[in-house]
């Protein structure tokens, strides 16, 4: 697996441990948390990244650790089970034997149940809508410049084939990026739209997953584009199954 | 209720309609959504603000409207029921007769049920932990300067009495602001910690609720402090009641 030879690091994933113990003394990198070997010439799967994130040592000793009774609106962080290819297993369970089904981006798509819950297949998220709001600027960005810049970003930084960026919509200050990728369209070696969206989300939050590439610096004709709010919507090939109770 | 007399606007709440029809032709402002009169010399309650937010016309016509099957991690936005004082009613229900109990900041604190669900009292959130991560800077901020600046901000911008800012913790790049306010401590006219935290949260997101006061501009000894991630934990006087299924 390609990794920076001389100093043996993984350019596409800083949440790795690398050593020159691959075939012929080649640099090999393993994801934290799972210990799985990763290909450093492309993005690491979201499942392995989440697992690494949950395994990272929590240092902040002098800070307050919220009580177990604290309420917070944050459903998306958990320690996932990944399959041998690094994809999310269709069924995820926690330590207290509560289980639920997820889609290919690891987002829950059923009510929670017990160990008897069955998730027959990993349902593919084939359409991702990234909804951003940018900070105020002197004027609106030029739509076609913005479109070109975001397509370039997804191609260069996240290695996502341009055909998977279906559209870029803009109505100041809202930008929407539509990623589409059916099971049939995704060829071997293609970056998954879910992984590209996750890297982008972490970049926007200033939590870049890349090693030594600096943070995301988004500019349209030299003008910085600073994002102040992000919402990501995931659409699955098969609609999710929730009871009425979810519909608030 | 105090409002800017001559141009009749509400400095503390832009989600209002104001007209000079108060006693003696004084400017009176009513919250959008509820039509309730608000006091423009202090913060408007979070319940009325959420109600106004949900009633605001959605314009963005050319943008994609996510399908009803789209998954998004965002549980905190709903159209609430507020009491005559503008506080959250203890029980909230949606159009499909799904009900749940909330705390004084409007965050769900029980599993969802049906119309038979009882919420005996509005449980007070007496401790709020605001967990921020700031953008990288040349060096760490001086802790006491940061502490003083955040206390000043809460006092000046949100009119929160300094005694309710219990502590400011800092371990670069994480900042934690602890707000504490028991039922017994809160006197008439005191700003509620939940309202102050909500205004702060909206300010951080670049969605200031103030009229004519500019966005939030946070500085420590002149150095801009830019927040890139916020998590808010709410602790209630009585712990929340969730079934085991919540514990993921």
């Amino acid at each position: 697996h390609t990794a920076a030879q001389d100093n043996c690091t993984c350019p596409t994933n800083k949440m790795t441990v690398c050593s020159p113990d691959g075939p012929g003394g080649r640099c090999q990198c393993r994801a934290l948390g799972s210990g799985m070997a990763v290909d450093c010439s492309t993005l690491t799967s979201k499942c392995l990244l989440l697992k690494a994130r949950m395994s990272a040592p929590k240092n902040a000793r002098t800070l307050v650790r919220p009580s177990e009774h604290a309420l917070v609106d944050n459903d998306g962080l958990y320690d996932p089970d990944c399959d041998p290819e690094g994809r999310f297993k269709a069924r995820q369970c926690n330590q207290t034997s509560v289980c639920w089904c997820v889609n290919s981006v690891g987002v829950r798509r059923t009510d929670k149940g017990d160990l008897s819950l069955r998730c027959d297949e990993l349902v593919r998220t084939h359409h991702i809508l990234i909804d951003l709001r940018h900070r105020p600027t002197a004027g609106a960005f030029n739509h076609s410049d913005l479109d070109a810049e975001l397509r370039r970003l997804f191609r260069e930084r996240y290695r996502l084939h341009p055909k998977f960026v279906a559209a870029v919509h803009y109505e100041q200050p809202t930008i929407q990026i539509e990623l589409r990728q059916n099971t049939s369209q995704k060829a071997a070696g293609d970056v998954d739209i879910g992984d590209a969206a996750y890297y982008f989300e972490r970049d926007i939050k200033g939590e870049s997953l890349f090693q030594g590439r600096g943070g995301l610096d988004l500019r349209v004709r030299g003008e910085p584009l600073q994002v102040e709010r992000t919402l990501i919507y995931y659409l699955d090939e098969i609609p999710p199954k929730f009871s009425m109770k979810r519909l608030t | 209720h105090t409002a800017a007399q001559d141009n009749c606007t509400c400095p503390t709440n832009k989600m209002t309609v104001c007209s000079p029809d108060g006693p003696g032709g004084r400017c009176q402002c009513r919250a959008l959504g509820s039509g309730m009169a608000v006091d423009c010399s202090t913060l408007t309650s979070k319940c009325l603000l959420l109600k106004a937010r949900m009633s605001a016309p959605k314009n963005a016509r050319t943008l994609v409207r996510p399908s009803e099957h789209a998954l998004v991690d965002n549980d905190g936005l709903y159209d609430p029921d507020c009491d005559p004082e503008g506080r959250f009613k203890a029980r909230q229900c949606n159009q499909t007769s799904v009900c749940w109990c909330v705390n004084s900041v409007g965050v769900r604190r029980t599993d969802k049920g049906d119309l038979s669900l009882r919420c005996d009292e509005l449980v007070r959130t007496h401790h709020i932990l605001i967990d921020l991560r700031h953008r990288p800077t040349a060096g760490a901020f001086n802790h006491s300067d940061l502490d003083a600046e955040l206390r000043r901000l809460f006092r000046e911008r949100y009119r929160l009495h300094p005694k309710f800012v219990a502590a400011v913790h800092y371990e670069q790049p994480t900042i934690q602001i602890e707000l504490r306010q028991n039922t017994s401590q809160k006197a008439a006219g005191d700003v509620d910690i939940g309202d102050a935290a909500y205004y702060f949260e909206r300010d951080i997101k670049g969605e200031s609720l103030f009229q004519g006061r500019g966005g939030l501009d946070l500085r420590v000894r002149g150095e801009p402090l830019q927040v890139e991630r916020t998590l808010i934990y709410y602790l209630d006087e009585i712990p929340p009641k969730f079934s085991m299924k919540r514990l993921t």
């Epitope: 105020p136 | 901000l153 500019g214 002149g222």
Partner: antibody, heavy 121, light 107 residues
């Protein structure tokens, strides 16, 4: 050190135009807004408005809408105040003042020395 | 617009005296009030912001207090170099407004 250097005094006739400059040094220009304050001879201070140095967006106080224009040359860390169709009542000292982007910092911690504009026929 | 009223146009004092200047806002401005000192032929200089916060390098004989609509600026022991005009300013909401000024002079 941090300073705002303003252009020199101006003597103009009614109906003419004047453009005053305010050059900032010693700090990141775009980290602060630039305010303009008028002081007529023997009178108090009057806020004219401010310009957002990040976006170039000006905000004018009601009294100064129309003939007054704020502008920037960001690459030169310079703000400008232009007054068109000068009137006798525009005779005053004009100060630029550094301030923040929100009300918590809408006081002026650094001031220029002032530019005196005299309008006389 | 918010009107800032400084009740005294002039105040007479002696070196070593304690002097207080008041400023009243026409509506509640939280604690968003600054105080400036201006000497003849000079630009104003900020002394206090947010009602009671002393600006960097300002001597501790200068203090401020108040909230809502009533504000006070105090010099605990007047020195000869303190003779100047003092202005209050609300930094709560635009348009930003100043008081008319209070001139501190020797008795």
């Amino acid at each position: 050190q941090i300073q705002l250097v303003q252009s020199g005094p101006e003597l103009k006739k009614p109906g003419e135009t004047v453009k005053i400059s305010c050059k900032a040094s010693g700090y990141t220009f775009t980290n602060y807004g630039m305010n303009w304050v008028k002081q007529a001879p023997g009178k108090g201070l009057k806020w004219m408005g401010w310009i957002n140095t990040k976006t170039g967006e000006p905000t004018y106080a009601e009294e100064f809408k129309g003939r007054f224009a704020f502008s920037l040359e960001t690459s030169a860390s310079t703000a400008y105040l232009q007054i068109n169709n000068l009137k006798k009542e525009d005779t005053a000292t004009y100060f630029c003042g550094r301030g923040g982007y929100g009300s918590s910092y809408w006081y002026f911690d650094v001031w220029g020395a002032g530019t005196t504009v005299t309008v006389s026929s | 617009d918010i009107v800032m009223t400084q009740s005294h146009k002039f105040m007479s004092t002696s070196v070593g005296d304690r002097v207080s200047i008041t400023c009243k806002a026409s509506q509640d401005v939280s604690i968003a009030v600054a105080w400036y000192q201006q000497k003849p032929g000079q630009s104003p200089k900020v002394l206090i912001y947010s009602a009671s916060y002393r600006y960097t390098g300002v001597p501790d004989r200068f203090t401020g207090s108040g909230s809502g609509t009533d504000f006070t600026f105090t010099i605990s022991r007047v020195q000869a170099e303190d003779l100047a005009v003092y202005y209050c300013q609300q930094h709560y909401i635009t348009p930003l407004t100043f008081g008319a000024g209070t001139k501190l002079e020797l008795k």
